[in-house]
């Protein structure tokens, strides 16, 4: 099934001119992010029923090993060079999720809704910071790693990688809202 | 006709490999699908061996009891699975089934008439 | 590790008896067990799956209930070809030392 965020190397053929208040804009999203990253982590763990909700330390941690870095401290392009890489590996690991819980807990409507709702503030924040990366920086390319393929896991495995990388997004967002 | 069919078991001695195979018919090995190896000693209950996604990651799923002995894998381009079983025991003989499951793979829906291992 | 305990390991029972197997989980597995039927020399066949859908073409008599750690399965009467054994298993964790299956309940005629 196709993932919510499935970019290509990006070109800066930008099809539209960029929206005035580029970095407003963004800022504007990561905020409305860390806003509701709370409430989606705790709608995803109650919705896993046990183990999760008194696990969560162990189950729901964000030790998400390979996870793209980010260094709040870095220029404006750098960190929009990172917040790129972070935002395409949220994405596909956000469709991983959606994908799962659409098996798993196909009743857990709000949950799908919430997490629908996250992915398409995802893809509008990575066309945002690709317009602002390419008319300001000519940044017309940027490697990037996607979020772990869910598919061959076990039940337990699917919930638990799911719990784990929403802690990481709970706790990235905060920090990248503040950053920009 | 959606069928899943054993072959390659037989008499070995302790120590010797076996590989059994489960042709799948019916249905194709390249959607989200799981196939595993279920056994059953003589007069004893199930026991599960290993699962296989045979989507594009492959991840396999392995008992304590086998784990390192044997290997599963699949060829998706002849819709087959197999088993691969070294370093083989008396307590492995038993009749091995091959089973299938949709993803999530939380129950097996798809068995195969078993082929019986003997180790001897 | 989940551990799989299913009682009784086997029973008599007569024609039209309502009989109920009980499968307990060492830990949670949520709703993710599963219920099936094996008659001697054949292989197993899914009766319930996720704790109480019924499986396609299974008699309605064949009902499944429990989540968490505690489930059950009933048959409501009897029949002469419902004489086989029953094998619950948990769909839950595949880990190497999970164990799947229960040990099974051998249902004898009376």
């Known amino acids: 099934s196709p993932l919510p965020i499935t970019p290509v190397n990006a070109t800066c053929a930008i099809r539209h001119p960029c929206h005035n208040n580029l970095m407003n804009q963004i800022r504007s999203q990561l905020a409305q992010l860390n806003g509701s990253a709370n409430a989606l982590f705790i709608l995803y763990y109650t919705a896993q029923g046990e183990p999760f909700p008194n696990n969560l330390d162990k189950l729901c941690g964000p030790n998400v090993t390979d996870f793209p870095p980010f260094h709040a401290n870095g220029t404006e392009k750098a960190k929009l060079v990172e917040l790129y890489r972070i935002v395409v590996y949220l994405g596909t690991s956000l469709g991983n999720i959606t994908r799962d819980q659409k098996i798993l807990n196909p009743s857990a409507l709000s949950l799908h809704s919430k997490l629908n709702a996250t992915a398409d503030i995802l893809r509008g924040l990575l066309s945002n910071v690709l317009c602002r990366l390419c008319s300001k920086y000519h940044v017309g390319h940027v490697d990037v790693t996607y979020g772990p393929d869910t598919s061959g896991k076990d039940v337990f495995q699917k919930k638990k990688l799911g719990c784990q990388l929403l802690g990481k997004y709970k706790q990235i967002i905060a920090v990248l809202a503040q950053a920009f | 006709e959606v069928q899943l069919v054993e072959s390659g078991g037989g008499l070995v001695q302790p120590g010797g490999s076996l590989r059994l195979s489960c042709a799948a018919s019916?249905?194709?090995?390249?959607?989200?699908?799981?196939m595993s190896w279920v056994r059953q000693a003589p007069g004893k209950g199930l026991e599960w061996v290993s699962s296989?996604?045979?989507?594009?990651?492959?991840?396999?799923y392995y008992a304590d009891s086998v784990k390192g002995r044997f290997t599963i894998s699949r060829d998706n381009s002849k819709n087959t699975l197999y088993l691969q079983m070294d370093s083989l025991r008396a307590e492995d003989t038993a009749i091995y089934y091959c089973a299938g499951a949709d993803n999530p793979y939380d129950y097996f829906n798809l068995w195969g008439q078993g082929t019986l291992v003997t180790v001897s | 590790d989940i551990q799989m305990t299913q009682s009784p390991s086997s029973l008599s029972a007569s024609v039209g008896d309502r009989v109920t197997i009980t499968c307990r989980a060492s830990e949670t597995i949520s709703g993710y067990l599963n219920w099936y039927q094996q008659k001697p020399g054949k292989a197993p066949k899914l009766l319930i799956y996720r704790a109480s859908s019924l499986q396609s073409g299974v008699p309605s008599r064949f009902s499944g209930s429990g989540s968490g750690t505690d489930f059950t399965l009933t048959i409501s009467s009897l029949q002469p070809e419902d004489f086989a054994t029953y094998y619950c298993q948990q769909g839950y964790s595949y880990s190497d030392t999970d164990n799947v299956f229960g040990g099974g309940t051998k249902v004898e005629i009376k």
């Open positions: 296989i996604y045979v989507g594009t990651s492959g991840d396999t």
């Open positions: 019916g249905f194709s090995f390249s959607t989200d699908y799981w």
